[in-house]
């Protein structure tokens, strides 16, 4: 058993049929010694008396809010949560496996630049009685500070018969140098509590590996005289690290119709303009990637050919 | 030293082309190592990230773009003295800082070159003959060093008398390649920045 926060405790249980469970001793936070009784949740049934209560925690029915009283007055609470371990593996029932970039990916994180700010998100099908708390640091043995905000519900989607909820959190490394060469990874820890179930999820990464620039901005077309060719130009996204001559991007320019199966014109360039062949009912799209360290491509920025 | 025929623009900052070749060569070698040593811990997640130049050179600090010198987190300044000549400075009014930056890059390359050559000598003794260092990568390091053209004491190649542990050597190779790739990215950014200045 360990304390998650004030008056909230996590009991770690090996979860298998007829498991013996864990013996837990609760102590009432009071100077009183006599006349103390214990109850669980909303029940008025007295579970025991005295300053301490010893219980055998085996299942979710044994978890919940234990309250000690004296003469009708509440003295203190202890909330017990369960953390299940099945076949030596901690349960991951609350969050959905996103399977990208690999199996057992519950947290996904991205950064728009090298400033030390990043966003992580996760998915669940649970809609109520759900709380998240996020902590982060650079390195684990001698951790350096990363400050994370509160996790918020950022999107809701319908997936077949199920509703899927996306939560996200923004974090900022306390003293980040965009030009630094990372040798210690960022660690992100998410505590998830659904009703009386506790789970924790972690992710470890270098900012350089989670970079995904915003799409290029200000796409403009200039038809070339006596030609089907069009000069397309664009600018670096505002959110990208500066100076751009140091933090350079490379670009992919594509002309394609509405269907992905349609024919296309595609060219890669380090410049902020390119010449392509425009077709009726097609769109010109441009995306960006760090020129020197190949992490993710940005989403496409598009303009119609016409 | 003459630049290769295909360098796009003869007036170009002389080291940019070499630094691009360097990053490409290191990335290719790292990819080859990850494929060949698939049963060894050789991915970014599996290895310890060590920097053999730590406390010996200060490339990131010395080569910081002017725009980032206002960022206090970037000014983890270390006092290091370097030689201040070099052909990449040709026909440019170069600040002392730029000379410091380029000589720091030169020292990095020299240290990695020694490490790689020592390691290759060990790998050549491996009866499995599983992996060797790409000669192209070693040649590209040499070309960039010559383009930088700093005079500096030669570092003797480390020789070891004891029987090499090939497993450890291969893991060390992965660690070294990962670190060198990160440094090659920094070098490429620096050259691009100086070329634009």
């Amino acid at each position: 058993i360990w304390e998650l926060k004030k008056d909230v405790y996590v009991v770690e249980l090996d979860w298998y049929p007829d498991a013996p469970g864990e013996m837990v001793v609760l102590t009432c936070d009071t100077p009183e010694e006599d006349g103390i009784t214990w109850t669980l949740d909303q029940s008025s049934e007295v579970l025991g008396s005295g300053k301490t209560l010893t219980i055998q925690v085996k299942e979710f029915g044994d978890a919940g809010q234990y309250t000690c009283h004296k003469g009708g007055e509440v003295l203190s609470h202890s909330l017990l949560l369960l953390h299940k371990k099945e076949d030596g593996i901690w349960s991951t029932d609350i969050l959905k496996d996103q399977k990208e970039p690999k199996n057992k990916t519950f947290l996904r994180c991205e950064a728009k630049n090298y400033s030390g700010r990043f966003t992580c998100w996760w998915l669940t099908t649970i809609s109520t009685d759900l709380t998240f708390s996020v902590k982060s640091s650079r390195g684990s043995s001698d951790p350096q500070g990363v400050t994370c905000g509160a996790a918020t519900l950022s999107a809701e989607r319908v997936r077949g018969d199920n509703k899927e909820y996306e939560y996200s959190v923004e974090c900022q490394e306390d003293s980040a140098c965009p030009a630094a060469e990372e040798s210690l990874p960022i660690e992100v820890m998410v505590d998830a509590v659904h009703k009386l179930k506790y789970e924790n999820y972690t992710s470890s990464f270098f900012i350089r590996d989670i970079i995904k620039p915003d799409p290029p901005k200000n796409l403009q077309l200039k038809p070339l005289k006596n030609s089907r060719q069009v000069e397309v130009s664009w600018e670096y996204p505002d959110t990208w690290s500066t100076p751009h001559s140091y933090f350079s991007l490379t670009f992919c320019v594509q002309v394609q119709g509405k269907s992905k199966r349609e024919k296309k014109d595609r060219v890669f360039t380090d410049k902020t303009s390119a010449t392509v062949i425009c077709r009726k009912n097609a769109s010109i799209s441009v995306r960006a990637q760090d020129r020197y360290y190949s992490s993710s491509w940005s989403e496409w920025a598009s303009v119609p050919c016409s | 030293r003459n630049l290769p025929v295909a360098t796009p623009d003869p007036g170009m900052f002389p080291c940019l082309h070499h630094s691009q070749n360097l990053l490409r060569a290191v990335s290719n070698m790292l990819q080859k190592a990850r494929q060949t040593l698939e049963f060894y811990p050789c991915t970014s997640e599996e290895i310890d990230h060590e920097d053999i130049t730590k406390d010996k050179t200060s490339t990131v600090e010395a080569c910081l773009p002017l725009e980032l010198t206002k960022n206090e987190s970037c000014l983890n300044s270390r006092e290091t003295s370097f030689i201040t000549n070099g052909s990449c400075l040709a026909s440019r009014k170069t600040s002392f800082m730029m000379a410091l930056c380029l000589s720091s890059i030169y020292e990095d390359l020299k240290m990695y070159q020694v490490e790689f050559k020592t390691m290759n000598a060990k790998l050549l003794m491996d009866p499995k003959r599983q992996i060797f260092l790409d000669q192209n990568m070693l040649a590209v390091i040499d070309e960039l060093m010559q383009a930088l053209n700093f005079n500096s004491e030669t570092v003797p190649q480390k020789s070891s008398l004891e029987e090499p542990d090939f497993y450890k050597t291969k893991i060390k190779l992965c660690i070294l390649l990962h670190a060198f790739r990160i440094r090659a990215v920094t070098i490429d950014r620096v050259m691009s920045y100086l070329n634009a200045s």
Partner: antibody, heavy 118, light 107 residues
Framework: QVQLVQSGAEVKKPGSSVKVSCKAS????????LHWVRQAPGQGLEWMGW????????EYAPKFQGRVTITADESTSTAYMELSSLRSEDTAVYYC???????????WGQGTLVTVSS | DIVMTQSPLSLPVTPGEPASISCRAS??????LHWYQQKPGQQPRLLIA???QSISGVPSRFSGSGSGTDFTLTISSLQPEDFATYYC?????????FGQGTKVEIK
């Protein structure tokens, strides 16, 4: 299986024209760009131009501009390349080729040998 | 026009040994570079697109690298069926242009 079948070999006199055909099968004809590339005996590859069969748009290499005409007939899934004012240095194997990507080629015809000789 | 220069023009290799072919562009072409193989009396065959992207059906012993002006096609271990002429092609701008070809021959 995508296939491009070209017309047979031709012998032409200098100053005359030649029209080589290329019939496509497998896949929708207008879903691909069609290119013509030639190869003189013992020499390398030389790109001549492309056509978009969907709208008839063409682009020619400056070297052949004014001498080459690429056309396409959607109804028969056939592309044509006509080269005029032939000279002996136009002796080559002419390939038609196609791809959904405009700037490189993934399927080639078997080639048509055009010999220009007096 | 962008001039593509291949080297060497002839490459004698022992079967089972690796081979590398270089292709240089007269100006920077990013990764807009493709590789083809041609055997005598046959049409060319696409091997690699955009400098390093493998093509389905092409053996994994063929790999490409490079960007900007310098590109390399590598065959990790030459098989008897790999003896052929190899061409690079730039797609950075029209007209599309090819290298002059590299003939890989049995040593």
């Amino acid at each position: 299986q995508v296939q491009l079948v070209q017309s047979g070999a031709e012998v032409k006199k200098p100053g005359s024209s030649v029209k080589v055909s290329c019939k496509a099968s497998g896949g929708t004809f207008s879903d691909y760009y069609l290119h013509w590339v030639r190869q003189a005996p013992g020499q390398g590859l030389e790109w001549m131009g492309w056509i978009d069969p969907e709208n008839g748009d063409t682009e020619y290499a400056p070297k052949f501009q004014g001498r080459v005409t690429i056309t396409a007939d959607e109804s028969t899934s056939t592309a044509y390349m006509e080269l005029s004012s032939l000279r002996s240095e136009d002796t080559a194997v002419y390939y038609c080729a196609r791809n959904k990507e405009l700037r490189y080629i993934d399927v080639w015809g078997q080639g048509t040998l055009v010999t220009v000789s007096s | 026009d962008i001039v593509m220069t291949q080297s060497p023009l002839s490459l004698p290799v022992t079967p089972g040994e690796p081979a590398s072919i270089s292709c240089r562009a007269s100006q920077s072409i990013s990764i807009n570079l493709h590789w083809y193989q041609q055997k005598p009396g046959q049409q060319p065959r696409l091997l690699i697109a955009f400098a390093s992207q493998s093509i389905s059906g092409v053996p994994s012993r063929f790999s490409g690298s490079g960007s900007g002006t310098d590109f390399t096609l590598t065959i990790s271990s030459l098989q008897p069926e790999d003896f052929a002429t190899y061409y690079c092609q730039q797609s950075n701008s029209f007209p599309l242009t090819f290298g002059q070809g590299t003939k890989v021959e049995i040593k």
